[in-house]
Interface confidence: low
């Protein structure tokens, strides 16, 4: 339904606390570079305005598109061409062409020291002092680094922040209490932000219907017990919700989160039993609950796949009447039967059905051609499988830094172009995926495993395309979405690439490593053997393990020395010297 | 269908005990967190305490910080509270609620401390 003011509309339907706190991620996330002071003040501008449209929606201006009135705040920003270069250009637009401007000048890697947390006792004075500045500095510093950040779920993280707080600066130890809550959230809302900025890719990249495919399979997976009718509806109502979120429509994007979560609470029975229990929780909690409620019980009695999309004599006929409802059918059908396949990996094959039925329903006898097409299907889900049980094998028997270790060896051979500081970033993200995936239960592993890797693979890809340095990275960047992981899978060593030469102050440490916190040695560790991947791009596993060795044996012994100066600087030019000899 | 029902409540006096009992069926109540809270004559609900699934973890509102504890028994599909130097302001309707909602559904078990 329209409304004379959606301002007014909005600002009623979140109340004010959510409003705020969208305005600030929205605008946090169009111009990255602002201080939180300068976001809060036009925050108020606009909250204030919103009040007044709520008083009398005929006011004056009230009755403007949200990009507008945005947008008009935005241009109004002194200094805008000193502080953001060409990004001011935007703002000789006219809408829609002025928002679709301001999101191409989205920066995914904005020149942003890293978001240092405070000590303890610091956080608790300014938390007490004023809670919902601090939380909007929270929102500010993540909504600023994660551009695309899914903006209701950052309100929920920025509850979770606020929950620990409350509890955590009462206690004695508040450190020991902060830290292990506070390191999950973070871990937790980083896996969020790509998974999300993978969603909008799809959508910028491949548009709506890439993304209905995707949340077809997983709602499918989820819900196996609900019909298509209902599958197709979810997933419409999902796409419209990250639709407006990647597109910064944020007031649309939670009202309709917020909208679409009631209307699952209001139709469980349709849906899944498993509902219950996030229905019960507040607005931000069951949102987030939802999104990730287990998968229902399959249904016992289902038909083998075949059935319907191979034995059926009309399958041709069913295919060219309606062809996106009937392999909308085939991946929910085949999605709901195996919760234990990756989204990916479903979506591999409904191509893979799709490009067969193209094919077969073509030729003389069509049954005859696409009747081995479930079997086609085997190969496409043993290379995942075997992908899984590899790493993770890996994994067990090298620990989370050693199995990122080895990743960094193998991607920095595949694409010894790119950054050191980008492959050591992937690596160790994508080395995270054995404590994240490989613990679960055999039946939970393969999605867990490809659909992150994807995700973080998507980052890797538009890191690259500001700088692209690497025709191999291009090549599987180039594709699409799903094959992405596959095509990284199968890369070898880069032939054409001519190794760096060696600089002894690439290897060069001093004493100050030492004081370092072990993230940051196991950085400076990595960097160093990306180094010397790219150096050497054909040492073997064992010559590296080797200089690592030595390496960690080094810092080992200088960390511990009376005068570690000393140390650095006489035993430093020594592992320079076994490192080169090692690797010669 | 979801089913938490509490008991043990009653009339007291200041600096007395109770232990309140939830039992849960419907749901496998061993896979949730659980929490208490209480709803005082006029007031919103007031989150008291909450457990995690396995039990290991628990938390406590300031308020009643060392004088109530939580348990639960997974076999037993039960959720405990322990009320030790009850106070008046303690006197509230006390429900137990699946995760860290504040949202009831359930009947509750009233508390009253009173001389």
């Known amino acids: 339904e329209a409304h004379k003011s959606e301002i007014a509309h909005r600002y009623n339907d979140l109340g004010e606390q959510h409003f705020k706190g969208l305005v600030l991620i929205a605008f946090s996330q169009y111009l990255q570079k602002c201080s939180y002071d300068e976001h809060a003040k036009l925050v108020q501008e606009v909250t204030d305005f919103a009040k007044t449209c709520v008083a009398d929606e005929s006011a004056a201006n009230c009755d403007k598109s949200l990009h507008t009135l945005f947008g008009d705040k935005l241009c109004a920003i002194p200094n805008l061409r000193e502080n953001y270069g060409e990004l001011a250009d935007c703002c000789t637009k006219q809408e829609p062409e002025r928002n679709e401007c301001f999101l191409q000048h989205k920066d995914d890697n904005p020149s942003l020291p890293p978001f240092e947390r405070p000590e303890a006792e610091a956080m608790c004075t300014s938390f007490k002092e004023n809670p919902t500045t601090f939380m909007g500095h929270y929102l500010h510093e993540v909504a600023r680094r994660h551009p695309y950040f899914y903006a209701p779920e950052l309100l929920y993280y920025a509850e979770q922040y606020n929950e620990i707080l409350t509890q955590c600066c009462a206690e004695a130890d508040k450190e020991s209490c902060l830290t292990p809550k506070l390191d999950g959230v973070k871990e937790k809302a980083l896996v969020s932000s790509v998974r999300q900025r993978m969603k909008c890719s799809s959508m910028q990249k491949f548009g709506e219907r890439a993304f209905k495919a995707w949340a077809v399979a997983r709602l499918s997976q989820t819900f196996p017990n609900a019909d298509f009718a209902e599958i197709t509806k979810l997933a419409t109502d999902l796409t419209k919700v990250n639709k407006e979120c990647c597109h910064g429509d944020l007031l649309e994007c939670a009202d309709d989160r917020a909208e679409l979560a009631k209307y699952m609470c209001e139709n469980q029975a349709t849906i899944s039993s498993k509902l219950q229990t996030c229905c019960d929780k507040p607005l931000l909690k069951k949102a987030h609950c939802l999104s990730e409620v287990e998968h229902d019980t399959m249904p016992a009695d289902l038909p083998a796949i075949a059935a319907d999309f191979v034995e059926d004599q009309e399958v041709c006929k069913n295919y060219a009447e309606a062809k996106d409802v009937f392999l909308g059918t085939f991946l929910y059908e085949y999605s709901r039967r195996h919760p234990d396949y990756s989204v990916s990996l479903l979506l591999r094959l409904a191509k893979k059905y799709e490009a067969t039925l193209e094919k077969c329903c073509a030729e003389a006898n069509p049954p005859a051609c696409y009747g081995t097409v479930l079997a086609e299907f085997q190969p496409l889900v043993e290379e995942p499988k075997n992908l899984v049980k590899t790493n993770c094998d890996l994994y067990e028997k090298l620990g989370e830094y050693g199995f990122q270790n080895a990743i960094l060896v193998r991607y920095t051979q595949k694409a010894p172009q790119v950054s050191t500081p980008t492959l050591v970033e992937a690596a160790r993200n994508l080395g995270r995926v054995g404590t994240k995936c490989c613990t679960l239960p055999e039946d939970q592993r393969l999605p867990c495993v490809e659909d992150y890797l994807s995700a973080i693979l998507n980052r890797v890809c538009l890191l690259h395309e500001k700088t692209p340095v690497s025709e191999h990275v291009t090549k599987c960047c180039s594709g699409s979405l799903v094959e992405r992981r596959p095509c990284f899978s199968a890369l070898t060593v880069d032939e054409t690439y001519v190794p760096k030469e060696f600089k002894a102050e690439t290897f060069t440490f001093h004493s100050d490593i030492c004081t370092l916190p072990e993230k940051e040695k196991q950085i400076k560790k990595q960097t160093a053997l990306a180094e010397l991947v790219k150096h050497k791009p054909k040492a073997t596993a064992e010559q590296l393990k080797t200089v690592m060795d030595d390496f960690a044996q080094f810092l080992d012994t200088c960390c511990k020395a009376a005068d570690k100066d000393t140390c650095f600087s006489t035993e430093g030019p020594n592992l320079v010297t076994r490192c080169k000899d090692a690797l010669a | 269908q979801v089913q938490l029902v509490e008991s043990g409540g009653g009339l007291v006096q200041p600096g007395g005990s109770l232990r309140l009992s939830c039992a849960a069926s419907?749901?496998?109540?061993?896979?949730?967190?659980m929490s208490w809270v209480r709803q005082a004559p006029g007031k919103g609900p007031e989150w008291v305490s909450a457990?995690?699934?396995?039990?290991?973890?628990?938390r406590y509102a300031e308020s009643i910080k060392g004088r109530f504890t939580i348990s639960r028994d997974n076999a037993k599909k039960t959720l405990y509270l322990q009320m030790n130097s009850l106070k008046p302001e303690d006197t509230a309707v006390y429900y137990c609620?699946?995760?860290?909602?504040?949202?009831?559904g359930s009947q509750g078990t009233q508390v009253t401390v009173s001389s």
């Open positions: 457990i995690d699934s396995g039990g290991t973890d628990t």
């Open positions: 609620t699946i995760g860290q909602s504040t949202s009831r």
């Open positions: 419907g749901f496998t109540f061993g896979s949730f967190g």
